[in-house]
């Protein structure tokens, strides 16, 4: 007798093969807050921004990208303290001479309003109130992200 | 009337809430080939180390962590072309003065025999033969990991 | 009890070394950004030095720069402060602090030592 | 480096008055500034961080106002244990990180 979990999968599976669907993730994980159609983990210690990237990485998710000034609010709001600063997955590229978000794109220069200097090292941080530009090597928190909803033919070409 | 997915979906909520544990991955996504309990993606574009553990991030994934020398070898033997080098998850730490994965581990110096030197600004690939030592700026292909199998009360603890 | 206890200050003569010691205890240390910071008799507050959670980081006043060198052992949860070629002008009390964590290089003292007096007189 | 300027040097003021201490920076620090109070012989006590965030512990008589360039520490009903010695310092992240010259509160 299988468990509705056992047969889930199989189910799942069977789908899979029609619809190259993923499963994704169905709900959050715990210690994993839910803003919308995304889980935010805060972290507790302090990383450069290179190691904070690596964590999330192997906890297979991506630092937090943010897509508009609205998504900023709403994550700002879960911020409970004023001189915290959290790292997301955005840096400034050298050769691009640009802000540029850990998936490729470059930032719309109207999305976040950057406090500090473009320049090389440099990596952004924000705290309740705002957004800044830091040195990589600072340590500080950071904000993990995972996708929430399943993502139907959801493929993965390189960057 | 419910698809079979859509039961899915609510009988792992359900599951979920008695035993903590994420839905994970039931099986590969499309692109990626299954090792073991692991996803892996063999990307077909280069980058140097860390633009490819950014790529991975954004995947929701981990550049490759490989626990043991059998690992490695059911790794490599996936791998077609003799010359073609792959990043994995695993660089130099000038401050720890040794070889470190992502994840915050040391490297076990009976894993891997790295040909090579150990120092700043080094980064490890694998090719279908062997493991080098190489200049993360360094741009060559690299290997992403989703981890296959759901994992109960699996938690995600600062690293 | 959450606490920064400082010793190592004494007399010492223009040109002499004295090495500081601040120890910590009643937080998780090695995820603070630790600074001394110190007082001339009768005088305000002047920053010296800091060094960030995992030690990569350093920097100093100028005032001490390449005379001072603070360092950090995580697993004995202590800070240092090595002074050499010492002058009559680094008289003062020398205090070690802890800056809010997460703020990073945005040094925001919340937690002081009681000080330790460094006195240079011939 | 950047100067932070403290006014007054001193005051003189009376249990229960209100008092305003205020800070100018030589240049734009937005809110990155923090105000100290320290008593003889004691080390320094961390009251505003942010320009405006109260210290867990610290009374809400004690509140701190501004950015950019000029800041203000206000007491809104002055306590026995208030008389001291008060400092801003700026913490924008490129070192030095300065202290004004400090303002001693007194007893009138």
């Known amino acids: 007798q299988k468990s509705s979990i056992e047969k889930c999968s199989v189910d799942i599976q069977q789908s899979r093969n029609k619809t190259t669907e993923r499963p994704g993730l169905l709900n959050c994980p715990i210690y994993w807050q839910q803003l919308r159609e995304k889980c935010l983990l805060f972290s507790h210690t302090v990383n450069p921004w290179n190691n904070s990237l690596a964590d999330c990485s192997t906890k297979e998710s991506s630092l937090l990208l943010i897509r508009d000034k609205d998504e900023l609010i709403h994550t700002q709001n879960l911020i409970r303290d004023k001189a915290i600063l959290f790292w997301i997955g955005l840096n400034f590229s050298l050769s691009e001479k640009n802000w540029k978000w850990i998936n490729g794109s470059f930032l719309n220069s109207n999305d976040l309003e950057i406090r500090g200097d473009a320049k090389e090292n440099s990596c952004i941080s924000i705290s309740q109130t705002s957004v800044y530009s830091e040195y990589c090597s600072t340590e500080i928190r950071w904000i993990c992200q995972k996708e929430l909803t399943p993502v139907r033919n959801k493929v993965y070409p390189d960057s | 009337q419910k698809s079979s997915i859509e039961k899915c979906s609510v009988d792992i909520q359900q599951s979920r809430n008695k035993t903590t544990e994420r839905p994970g991955l039931l099986n590969c996504p499309i692109y990626w080939q299954q090792l073991r309990e692991k996803c892996l993606l063999f990307s077909h574009t280069v980058n140097p180390w860390n633009n490819s553990l950014a790529d991975c991030s954004t995947k929701e994934s981990s550049l490759l962590l490989i626990r043991d020398k059998d690992e490695l070898i059911h790794t490599q033997n996936l791998i077609r072309d003799k010359a073609i080098l792959f990043w994995i998850g695993l660089n130099f730490s000038l401050s720890e003065k040794n070889w470190k994965w992502i994840n915050g581990s040391f490297l076990n110096s009976n894993d891997l025999e790295i040909r090579g030197d150990a120092k700043e600004n080094s980064c490890i690939s694998i090719s279908q033969t062997s493991v080098y030592s190489e200049y993360c700026s360094t741009e060559i292909r690299w290997i992403c990991q989703k981890e296959l199998t759901p994992v109960r009360n699996k938690v995600y603890p600062d690293s | 009890q959450v606490q920064l206890v400082e010793s190592g200050g004494g007399l010492v003569k223009p040109g002499g070394s004295l090495r500081l010691s601040c120890a910590a205890s009643?937080?998780?240390?090695?995820?603070?950004?630790m600074s001394w910071i110190r007082q001339a008799p009768g005088k305000g507050l002047e920053w010296v030095s800091y060094i960030s959670p995992s030690g990569a980081t350093i920097y100093y006043a100028d005032s001490v720069k390449g005379r001072f060198t603070i360092s950090r052992d995580n697993a004995k949860n202590s800070l240092y402060l090595q002074m050499n070629s010492l002058r009559a002008e680094d008289t003062a009390v020398y205090y070690c602090a802890r800056s809010l964590m997460a703020t990073g290089t945005h040094l925001y003292f919340d937690l002081w030592g009681r000080g330790t007096l460094v006195t240079v007189s011939s | 480096d950047i100067q932070l300027t403290q006014s007054p040097s001193s005051v003189s003021a009376s249990v229960g008055d209100r008092v305003t201490i205020t800070c100018r920076a030589s240049q734009g620090i937005s809110s990155w500034l923090a105000w100290y109070q320290q008593k003889p012989g004691k080390a320094p006590k961390l009251l505003i961080y942010?320009?405006?965030a109260l210290q867990s512990g610290v009374p809400s008589r004690f509140s701190g106002s501004g950015s950019g360039t000029d800041f203000t520490l206000t007491i809104s009903s002055l306590q026995p244990e208030d008389f001291a010695t008060y400092y801003c310092q700026q913490v924008t992240s490129a070192p030095p990180y300065t202290f004004g010259g400090g303002t001693k509160v007194e007893i009138k």
């Open positions: 942010a320009a405006s």
């Open positions: 009643g937080f998780t240390f090695s995820q603070y950004y």
